[in-house]
């Protein structure tokens, strides 16, 4: 166990042009605050996948009006840190979410209103018990400095929090194979006792007496590896006669969440969905009210004037959940046309198209010739998937719009000269041939190859090809 | 702007019947993909049926072979057949499109929603 803890340095225009606009003004008041939204591991998860490790509020902050014609420099902020608790182990690698948000101060009907002014998100390694770690980060034309650490709550100690200390029992030294616990060196590690027997290959605790299995093995001391066949049964038999996986206790046995809310399975653990008034990872948190900005996203916040009557965000379109915090998943409509990757960002789709493919929906493709001009009298030819121009003479490129060398192929045989000219090419053909491309040779009788020379042309004479 | 009206919502026993149309109707240059979302209370809101950018139906497991999905292209309209409802299926159900409002803008509409209840 532990608490994770975010100190906001500042947060104003970035550098470089464009600086934003100050979100207050004399007419409209303003203050912020922030939220943090921390995820376990480094993968690019969604921003509305629960914040797994926690979520926090900050206070808020001082009201501030904008000066008129001041440049907008940095926002008053609130006191204080933000804390994310975590019960478990820490995990060393997370994701985070750091949101900015703007309460409006003046005269709207139904109380104040909150708007995102800005999301940055990051993945980072953090070792618990480090020290603070400092960071920079842009979103638009606002930059935010901050910084982190992660610390463990005795008598939780290492960097995951997973050793145990305790008081020494004698003066001078620890116990036999027990280290003192740095930096409370007054202290020494306690001896962490998973269940007689559990495997120390393919177990762990974090708790005194539990055995707890890595991915791939089962059993009361993850000694059986899982075989997700020849299973009798559904449930399969017994998972120490034959390695069948048994599902063992799911993560909503008992019911995890707090408060009445129900629970639900996901990949990788639980979510809450929490009844009004409360929210968080467990809906263990309560007496929220509007004044608390409780609702995310845009949402608006109605009722909840005092910590006893409950209050309801109003989510808009594409979030829900009973703080707005969580997406709808329009990607499983598969929007994207031709294979392209879908990408739900909240304010819009956006589709990552395969190559070939373009437009909003990957919509456009850019291997047909359906809307295709090939420049300067090309034509275009579809084959295998691709097109081409077949260009014009003279012309050459993807589009027929640069000028073709007529002579670069060398189209002139035995040894016949090319010469580029404005309707084509010219070849002179070497002594003995003749033609177009000095492709025929001339018989030494003087006949040619040829029915007949064209009129006005001798043999040897260069032929112009139109 | 594009609008979305759904409508033949309503109260019907378990094994019972219904069908929900959805008329998209507004500054339309072509529709992308449209189809059936449905949210419980307490749940999550989860796809139902759709059309897919492809043109592909889509289905959920769970009502696959009891709901069928269909369109009328000249209306721009998409249909829930909905038979065999069972209690589960109660929710309110949305119609979303995802509609080209021109040769390169496409946007994201809800509908209002239309309240289907399953009861003895």
């Known amino acids: 166990a532990g608490v994770f803890e975010l100190q906001i340095h500042s947060f104003g225009p970035g550098p470089g042009p464009g600086a934003p606009r100050s979100p207050c003004s004399a007419r409209l008041p303003c203050r912020l605050f922030f939220r943090v939204c921390l995820k376990p591991g480094l993968s690019e998860e969604a921003a509305e996948s629960p914040c797994a490790l926690g979520a926090a509020l900050s206070a808020r902050g001082p009201v501030y009006t904008e000066q008129p014609g001041a440049p907008a420099p940095d926002l008053p902020l609130p006191d204080g840190l933000l804390q994310v608790p975590f019960r478990d182990a820490w995990p060393g690698t997370f994701s985070f979410i750091i949101e900015t948000w703007r309460e409006e101060l003046g005269d709207q009907i139904g109380g104040p209103a909150w708007s995102l002014l800005a999301r940055v998100a990051g993945r980072r390694r953090l070792a618990a018990g480090g020290p603070w770690a400092r960071d920079i980060q842009r979103a638009g034309a606002w930059e935010l400095r901050f910084s982190y650490r992660a610390r463990c709550e005795p008598p939780a100690v290492g960097t995951a929090c997973t050793r145990l200390c305790r008081p020494r029992s004698a003066p001078s030294r620890c116990g036999p194979g027990l280290r003192p616990c740095a930096p409370l060196e007054d202290e020494c590690e306690a001896p962490l006792v998973c269940r007689a027997g559990c495997s120390p290959e393919h177990g762990f605790c974090e708790q005194p007496g539990e055995c707890r299995c890595l991915e791939g093995w089962t059993g009361p001391l993850c000694t059986v590896p899982v075989s997700t066949s020849s299973c009798l049964s559904p449930r399969g038999p017994s998972s120490a006669t034959t390695g069948c996986l048994v599902p063992g206790p799911g993560p909503c046995d008992g019911n995890p969440c707090a408060n009445g809310g129900s629970c639900s399975e996901t990949p990788r653990s639980f979510e809450c969905t929490c009844p009004r008034g409360f929210y968080g990872l467990r809906c263990e948190v309560s007496g929220v009210t509007c004044a608390d900005g409780p609702c995310f996203n845009g949402g608006l916040c109605v009722g909840g004037a005092d910590p006893d009557s409950a209050y309801i965000c109003h989510c808009p379109p594409g979030f829900q959940g009973s703080n707005c915090e969580k997406r709808v998943d329009r990607c499983s409509l598969q929007p994207c046309r031709n294979g392209g990757l879908c990408l739900d960002l909240g304010h819009a789709l956006r589709c990552r198209c395969r190559a070939g493919f373009a437009g909003p929906r990957c919509e456009h493709d850019l291997d047909d010739c359906a809307g295709r001009a090939c420049a300067n009298g090309g034509t275009c030819v579809e084959g295998g998937g691709a097109h081409r121009c077949s260009c014009a003479l003279g012309f050459g490129g993807r589009d027929c719009r640069e000028r073709a060398d007529p002579c670069a192929a060398r189209p002139c045989a035995h040894g016949g000269r090319c010469y580029a000219h404005f309707s084509g090419l010219v070849c002179a053909c070497a002594p003995g041939y003749m033609g177009a491309r000095c492709e025929f040779p001339v018989h030494p009788d003087g006949a040619s190859a040829l029915p007949a020379a064209p009129p006005g042309l001798r043999p040897g004479d260069p032929q112009r090809y139109l | 702007e594009v609008q979305l009206v759904e409508s033949g919502g309503g109260e019907v026993q378990p094994g019972g019947s219904l069908r929900l149309s959805c008329a998209a109707s507004?500054?339309?240059?072509?529709?992308?993909?449209m189809g059936w979302y449905r949210q419980a209370p307490g749940k999550q809101r989860e796809l139902v049926a759709g059309?897919?950018?492809?043109?592909?139906?889509k289905y959920a497991e769970s009502v696959k072979g009891r709901f069928t999905i269909s369109r009328d292209n000249a209306k721009n309209t998409v249909y829930l057949q909905m038979s065999s409802l069972r209690a589960e299926d109660t929710a309110v159900y949305y119609c979303?499109?995802?509609?080209?409002?021109?040769?390169?803008?496409?946007?994201?509409?809800w509908g209002q929603g239309t309240l289907v209840t399953v009861k003895p």
């Open positions: 059309f897919t950018g492809d043109g592909m139906t």
């Open positions: 507004g500054s339309i240059f072509s529709i992308n993909a």
């Open positions: 979303a499109a995802d509609v080209f409002t021109d040769r390169d803008h496409v946007d994201w509409y």
